[in-house]
């Protein structure tokens, strides 16, 4: 019978030509009277075998990732009969696997949108790489991930490649930022190869900013034939989140006389200061009263940043406007 | 790293003038606005002036105003801040300091969050 | 032109909460920032915002403003939190600082 050990050749061997192992027959006395033939795929380009011995040789570089297992028959001849003196049998070279792979990150380019003061833990994203390299074999294409940069704002997991949020981070300060993950084989170990990736990471807007005035103080005038109804003047308040987000609703907090209002215009933002009584400049020439601005919609968990409405003083002066003689007979 | 670091200060007469600079590095400058305030020697911060990101707007403190400008120039990552008509009141420690927000936020809401070593200014006779 | 005002030192134990104050007119509908100064150093962002922290900065320190009155608390007060605080707010296009708190934290 046939007499041989499982074949193995190592992946991107240098060597011109590499022993790989030996096929003989049981019934080889070694005297040179038997003939060894290889057949198959690869039969004298890839591996030769030595017809006396039965050594075979790899004398081609292989790669395990462009083929991991050649299929080969053998033969064995009497030289003096010319017959078989074993069946025709078949067997497999493997071919060993070396880290000559790095990890490749496939689903680039990464980009995620996380909200804007997110609390720690939470999950961003997920990053993959593969590593061509036998994942059976030893430690080559087992993974490590991590941070080149990114810190203090993001983690990841090791094993995992899951990004996490690691600080709070706010939006007004800064809108992007660029995460960059490295995976490593071996399991980080001397040695390993490496691939790495850069993850681009938005923060998406919530209401953590509250309107405010621009100015502490203004100053408007109205005539005293103005009629009631007629806009006197616009103020003006400033809120750095962005969207509904930044939408506002200006009114009034004092204003004894009642004598005005203020209704906002939504599309410029603005607070429109109305006369709502006519005035009268003999009976009173100036006003002071205080306008407030609050956002339109603050969800519950957001109202720690929205604890007290800025409010804003309006001067109001009264101009004379010169009546028509009113004196009796 | 990100850093500001001024120079330019010194000893100068009352009345005299001194130019003081902001270099920044480590950061994109022509994003961000930037404030100088000032210390004088045992008192508190005092804030002189800023200037947006483009420098499309400077204001500044009312002790300063019509006597001390302050400009920028985006391609050199340098703030300035040209002091004339100095006066003994002047004499303290210049901190250039980053308003922290991105372009498009206005206000001072986020406070000032790289600063420089600061440069001292003398006003003397 | 706007005034905050600040109590001029504050001492406290170590391991215990030292509280600093910060009046100013109406402040609770402004934002107010704070910053820690050491001797001979430069001035470090610690609280903005009002109750918001810069990267780095331990939540030992928080903040907070209603009314007339902001505050900021430091728990578990330790020996390197001896130094100047300021708090800040912004006015009408201009910036304003109080005129400081010294935290004396005894030994």
């Known amino acids: 019978g046939w007499v041989w050990n499982q074949f193995f050749v190592p992946e991107e061997m240098n060597t011109t030509s590499h022993h790989i192992g030996q096929l003989r027959s049981d019934l080889d006395n070694g005297n040179n009277s038997f003939q060894y033939k290889l057949l198959g795929a690869g039969a004298g380009s890839t591996f030769i075998i030595d017809e006396r011995t039965g050594d075979i040789y790899a004398i081609q570089k292989l790669d395990r990732e462009e083929r991991s297992l050649y299929i080969l028959r053998a033969q064995v001849i009497d030289i003096a009969t010319g017959r078989a003196v074993e069946p025709e049998s078949e067997f497999v070279i493997k071919v060993s696997d070396i880290n000559d792979n790095e990890p490749k990150f496939l689903d680039e380019p990464y980009e995620a949108i996380v909200p804007e003061m997110s609390p720690e833990g939470t999950l961003v994203i997920q990053v993959t790489a593969s590593d061509a390299d036998d994942p059976s074999s030893g430690n080559n294409a087992r993974l490590l991930y991590s941070l080149l940069q990114g810190q203090p704002y993001f983690s990841v997991e090791p094993t995992t490649g899951v990004i996490r949020i690691s600080s709070k981070m706010d939006r007004e300060l800064q809108d992007e930022y660029w995460v960059i993950i490295q995976a490593k084989d071996m399991i980080g170990q001397p040695g390993a190869l490496s691939g790495t990736t850069s993850v681009l990471i938005k923060l998406s807007d919530v209401n953590d900013n509250k309107p405010i005035f621009k100015e502490s103080l203004y100053r408007l005038t109205v005539s005293e034939s103005a009629p009631t109804g007629t806009s006197i003047g616009t103020i003006m308040a400033y809120d750095n989140d962005i969207g509904e987000n930044a939408e506002m609703d200006y009114s009034i907090e004092e204003d004894d006389s009642q004598t005005f209002d203020i209704i906002t215009n939504h599309e410029t933002q603005e607070g429109i200061v109305i006369l709502k009584k006519k005035v009268d400049f003999e009976h009173q020439n100036h006003y002071g009263i205080r306008a407030k601005v609050k956002n339109h919609h603050v969800p519950e968990q957001l109202m720690k940043y929205h604890t007290e409405a800025s409010t804003t003083f309006i001067k109001i002066q009264v101009e004379d406007v010169d009546e028509p003689g009113g004196g009796g007979s | 790293q990100v850093q500001l670091v001024e120079s330019g200060g010194g000893v100068v007469q009352p009345g005299g003038s001194l130019r003081l600079s902001c270099a920044a590095s480590?950061?994109?400058?022509?994003?961000?606005?930037i404030h100088w305030v000032r210390q004088a020697p045992g008192k508190g911060l005092e804030w002189v002036a800023v200037i947006w990101y483009d420098g499309s707007n400077k204001y500044y403190a009312d002790s300063v105003k019509g006597r001390f400008t302050i400009s920028r120039d985006n391609s050199k990552n340098t703030l300035y801040l040209q002091m004339n008509s100095l006066r003994a009141e002047d004499s303290a420690v210049y901190y250039c300091?980053?308003?922290?927000?991105?372009?498009?936020?206005?206000?001072?809401?986020?406070?000032?969050?790289?600063w420089g070593q600061g440069t001292t200014v003398t006003v003397s006779s | 032109s706007y005034e905050l005002t600040q109590p001029p030192s504050v001492s406290v134990s170590p391991g215990q909460t030292a509280s600093i104050t910060c009046s100013g007119d109406?402040?609770?509908?402004?934002?107010v920032s704070w910053y820690q100064q050491k001797p001979g150093q430069s001035p470090i962002l610690v609280i903005y915002q009002d109750n918001k922290w810069p990267s780095g900065i331990p939540e030992r320190f928080s903040g907070s403003n209603s009314g007339n009155t902001a505050t900021l608390t430091i728990s578990g007060t330790q020996a390197m939190d001896e130094a100047d605080y300021y708090c800040q707010a912004w006015d009408s296009s201009t910036v304003v600082f109080g005129g400081g708190t010294k935290l004396t934290v005894l030994s």
């Open positions: 109406r402040l609770g509908e402004k934002y």
């Open positions: 300091a980053r308003r922290a927000g991105i372009p498009g936020t206005t206000g001072y809401y986020y406070g000032m969050d790289v």
């Open positions: 480590g950061f994109t400058f022509s994003r961000y606005g």
